[in-house]
Interface confidence: low
């Protein structure tokens, strides 16, 4: 187990022409926050696929108001690191998505509005326990600078967080064949070669494949407690035979999972499913608070200011789940009447009505063209007591006042899939391509806008890509 840590250094206009407009204004002050999504391996999955290694949301940054006439500066950032805990081994190779979100603080009905400002993605090699690697990524006219590392949580050590350290049994040296655990020199590296299933609490090994029991435990996997009360000839602590044994409890007996976690047996031992706010092998670690950014997709975290109180995620429209991690398909409720086409734009539902119908849900039957005007060069077409506008290219809607589907122009290059989004569109790139419009080919060696660090990790230097 361990933690992936991301430090955002700056987010602002990239070099070169076409500096982006500031995302905030005097009329609409806003603040930024970031979301990181991690996936194992050098995956080429779409942005919508699950963050199998984990995800995290930053705190909100300071409120920012654009100075009139001034170019967009580097924007004020949230304090602190984004931390993504991982339970299992660190995979060594991973893919990341870092999203920069804007929270508008104007007089929105129903609270703040969230919109995605930029999304960068990449694929990297990274050894746990190594130094901070630095990176620069561009998304359109924006540039994001950040550092990242993976570190193991004790007792795990090593480049994959798979070696374990244990306190020394003797003050002077480690057991046979075991090394001191750098950098914890007062601890010893625990062997990884015991028999599969050997109890980590009550068993140990000095040779590969064996499972020797600590005093008071027995059985092939040292999971059976020794009963001494009715013993005539008690056997030594390493005995795997019967003699003075009582049937041992199953791994879930007595429920080893703390804090209301539920226990399920596994081939090796047990697994705890933890309630919200707790994690760890036995759900013993509390302390997931709003500061940890547990709410995804712009969810607003409430409560949970201290580790003992639970947090609640208030999800923006279109998302649900205890961490706002699930997208709601609100169109499945068929809210658009009269054959209207339903569009879920994230922050709202939009119905695109058939000719002759109008209204938020296409509930109104329309008159003919009398007194009707079609905007943006559209022409009114009568028929059957209804009117419709035949709109010029690039416009749509009842009166041609709406811009057409942003994906209609096929803006995603190289076979990327386009998704209509409430801030415009998002491209999910085909394997081998990346960028806001999938315009950049990924380098053949698996690098994206910057090269992946080779095995052994190097601090890939971004300067040469400026």
């Amino acid at each position: 187990a361990g933690v992936f840590e991301l430090q955002i250094h700056s987010f602002g206009p990239g070099p070169g022409p076409g500096a982006p407009r500031s995302p905030c204004s005097a009329r609409l002050p806003c603040r930024l926050f970031f979301r990181v999504c991690l996936k194992p391996g050098l995956s080429e999955e779409a942005a919508e696929s699950p963050c199998a290694l984990g995800a995290a949301l930053s705190a909100r940054g300071p409120v920012y108001t654009e100075q009139p006439g001034a170019p967009a500066p580097d924007l004020p950032l949230p304090d602190g690191l984004l931390q993504v805990p991982f339970r299992d081994a660190w995979p060594g190779t991973f893919s990341f998505i870092i999203e920069t979100w804007r929270e508008e603080l104007g007089d929105q009905i129903g609270g703040p509005a969230w919109s995605l400002l930029a999304r960068v993605a990449g694929r990297r090699r990274l050894a746990a326990g190594g130094p901070w690697a630095r990176d620069i990524q561009r998304a359109g006219a924006w540039e994001l600078r950040f550092s990242y590392r993976a570190r193991c949580e004790p007792p795990a050590v090593g480049t994959a967080c798979t070696r374990l350290c244990r306190p020394r049994s003797a003050p002077s040296r480690c057991g046979p064949g075991l090394r001191p655990c750098a950098p914890l020199e007062d601890e010893c590296e625990a062997p990884l070669v015991c028999r599969a299933g050997c109890s980590p609490e009550h068993g140990f090994c000095e040779q590969p494949g064996e499972c020797r029991c600590l005093e008071g435990w027995t059985g092939p996997l040292c999971t059976v407690p020794v009963s001494t009360s009715s013993c005539l000839s008690p056997r030594g602590p390493s005995s795997a035979t019967t003699g003075c044994l009582v049937p041992g409890p199953g791994p879930c007996d007595g429920n080893p999972c703390a804090n209301g976690g539920s226990c399920s047996e596994t081939p090796r031992s047990f697994e705890c499913t933890c309630p919200r706010g707790f994690y760890g092998l036995r759900c013993e670690v509390s302390g997931v608070t709003c500061a940890d950014g547990p709410c995804f997709n712009g969810g607003l975290c409430v409560g949970g200011a201290d580790p003992d109180s639970a947090y609640i995620c208030h999800c923006p429209p279109g998302f649900q789940g205890s961490n706002c991690e699930k997208r709601v398909d609100r169109c499945s409720l068929q809210p658009c009447r009269n054959g209207g086409l339903c569009l879920d734009l994230g922050h709202a539902l939009r119905c695109r009505c058939r000719a002759g119908f109008a209204g938020p849900r296409c509930e109104h039957d329309l008159d003919d063209c009398a007194g009707r005007a079609c905007a943006n060069g559209g022409t009114c077409v009568e028929g059957g007591g209804a009117h419709r506008c035949s709109c010029a290219l690039g416009f749509g809607g009842r009166d041609c006042r709406e811009r057409a589907d942003p994906c209609a122009a096929r803006p995603c290059a190289h076979g990327g899939r386009c998704y209509a989004h409430f801030s415009g569109l998002v491209c999910a790139c085909a394997p081998g391509y990346m960028g806001a419009r999938c315009e950049f080919p990924v380098h053949p060696d698996g690098a994206s806008a910057l090269p992946a660090a080779p095995p052994g990790l190097r601090p890939g230097d971004p300067q040469r890509y400026l």
Partner: antibody, heavy 122, light 107 residues
Amino acid sequence: QVQLVQSGAEVKKPGASVKVSCKASGYTFISYWITWVRQAPGQGLEWMGDIYPGSGSTTNYNEKFKSRVTMTRDTSTSTVYMELSSLRSEDTAVYYCARETTVGGAYAMDYWGQGTLVTVSS
Amino acid sequence: EIVLTQSPATLSLSPGERATLSCRASQSINNNLHWYQQKPGQAPRLLIKYVSQSISGIPARFSGSGSGTDFTLTISSLEPEDFAVYYCQQTNSWPLTFGGGTKLEIK
């Protein structure tokens, strides 16, 4: 203009610790990595580690010094500190702080402090 | 760690001459190499970053070249103030390392 001003010379006994300061001015302190480099008398340059002042826990240390060096920062005074413990005579050197060239990235060092001579002698 | 070997250790030239300093890495460091100048009693000064990128305020007579493992710093026409020690530095892998230096002295 960018300036890095270091604390004065120190004389320490073996086994003691020394804490050298580096006060930055003329730029946004929290945005640039600060590196520490040392130079023993008549010798070359040796990289000790670096710190990102925007987050005090964001540090990289040379494995050679990892168990003895600690880098910290105080954003209220725009000062970075390098503490070296368990001093030995071979730690006698001039210790430099230096700022790296670009915000959040790059490893070349374009602005340097004047250096602090640390002498370890019994 | 990556070892940087600078040669020659000492180079004796006269003002107006061309100086060529070499830095060889024990393994490929791509273009993650920088050059510094250091005068007695002073801190080092960055001359060239990323093999060949110039630094503002550094005279145009300083230039860099090379790739992979072999790199060169060239001073096209030596001025009296150029006599100093020159170090290369790699930032391709941890720990960051410096070369042993080349002392450029007046002949």
